[in-house]
């Protein structure tokens, strides 16, 4: 089943997020992803947990998952590199790098996104954009076209309250508000973009969507710059 989750958002402007990727299993959307280099897509490690026997591919240049679009192209995956410390039972280190079978054909609808290398927290209250093909309501309706929502960054202390995530948010994670607007099932691995720069990746833990006391959790890419560099090099 798709992992992670856009609730309370709206349809994105077609092809305005040329870095957006759909990680697919056996031809169906599984998770979001973000093109970070010509031949590399960053996603969440948990996305591939149940994909052992399936065919993993990456769709780039898409707005609609089903309709033909000139910019759409499905790439095979040459190599999948989950972070060595990712584990099924935790949200920590939930990153995955997928090497495409060839360099992506770049254009207006396919373009890597610069990612944050400076390891500093995004200021609380900063509005960040999260996009994905995850479910759009509690009934589990899956959209065909890319959705997005603007979410304010939530400070770690609040996110770690006992009533919220109870200390689970380490320095390598960040939170965004989840009051009716939220990332949801199927959005995992997708990008949290602040000021045009990739700051976070939607984690793929199973949490309730749209509940303000259970903020969205995102892996801070800046905290993993050394690992990302070492794989991409």
């Amino acid at each position: 089943p798709p992992r992670g989750r856009i609730l309370g958002g709206r349809e994105a402007e077609a092809h305005a997020r040329p870095y957006m990727a759909s990680v697919q299993l056996n031809g169906a959307h599984l998770c979001g992803g973000v093109l970070v280099a010509e031949q590399w897509v960053l996603s969440a490690a948990h996305c591939l947990e149940d994909a052992a026997d399936g065919k993993v591919q990456v769709l780039l240049g898409a707005h609609s998952l089903s309709q033909p679009e000139p910019s759409k192209r499905l790439y095979d995956v040459l190599r999948a590199v989950p972070h060595p410390d990712s584990q099924p039972d935790t949200i920590d280190h939930d990153l995955l790098l997928l090497q495409l079978s060839e360099k992506a054909t770049l254009g207006p609808a396919v373009r890597p996104l610069p990612w944050q290398r400076v390891d500093r927290d995004v200021a609380p209250g900063t509005l960040c954009d999260v996009a994905g093909w995850g479910i759009v309501n509690h009934a589990g309706r899956r959209p065909d076209s890319l959705q997005h929502v603007l979410l304010p960054v939530l400070d770690r202390a609040t996110c770690n309250r006992r009533t919220h995530h109870d200390g689970a948010i380490t320095e390598r994670l960040m939170c965004a508000e989840s009051n009716r607007r939220d990332s949801c099932k199927g959005d995992s691995g997708g990008p949290l973009v602040c000021g045009g720069v990739l700051e976070g990746v939607v984690t793929s833990g199973s949490r309730v969507c749209g509940n303000r006391k259970k903020p969205g959790i995102y892996t801070r890419v800046a905290s993993y710059a050394a690992w990302i560099d070492s794989v991409l090099a």
Epitope: P84, D85, E171, R172, A225, A226, D229, S230, V231, A233
Partner: antibody
Amino acid sequence: QVQLQQSGAELARPGASVKMSCKASGYTFTTYTIHWVKQRPGQGLEWIGYINPSSDFTNYNQNFADKATLTADRSSSTAYMQLSSLTSEESAVYYCAIRLGYDRQGWYFDVWGAGTTVTVSS
Amino acid sequence: DIVMTQSHKFLSTSLGDRVSITCKASQDVGSAVAWYQQKPGQSPDLLIYWTFTRHTGVPDRFTGSRSGTDFTLTISNVQSGDLADYFCQQYSNYPLTFGGGTKLEIK
């Protein structure tokens, strides 16, 4: 086999600059990122930074950002490090190193040069 | 910056003994830790990476372990060729940082 051959010892005056080299052999030069590490006599190791020879992308330890300049010459399969405005603090052995590692993730180093000794003295 | 603390600058052991060299990270580094051996006048040699994985050709007398942010290199059946300096390194975050080193000596 894979080797990193470093240039010979340097004696320099305070305020001067030195440029040392690290010549790679036994592999395609653009395949591996070259890192530089400093070791002062009887001390630990300090990471200076790296250069990716295929893209010339550099990444510096901020403690060395104004001190070291990393470059690479693909035609001679050689990486260079220039140290400027030398003081006695720069008297050290400087190593170049790469990660061949079959798993291709993580910046640990399994091939090292023999080191270049820099002595700064008036 | 992440500080890697090797609390023992020197460790004395006897040939044939088992010795543990420790290294503590100042914050979470996952398992992104390597260990190196350095003999006088030589460059460092990689022993262990990703906390547990022995580098090619390293004898199985050398093992790496971890408890949280505490990392240990254990050498069993110490031989004369093991007398050297040992350094830990974290590569979880930039800047990459090394421990101050532990010199293994004979009692």
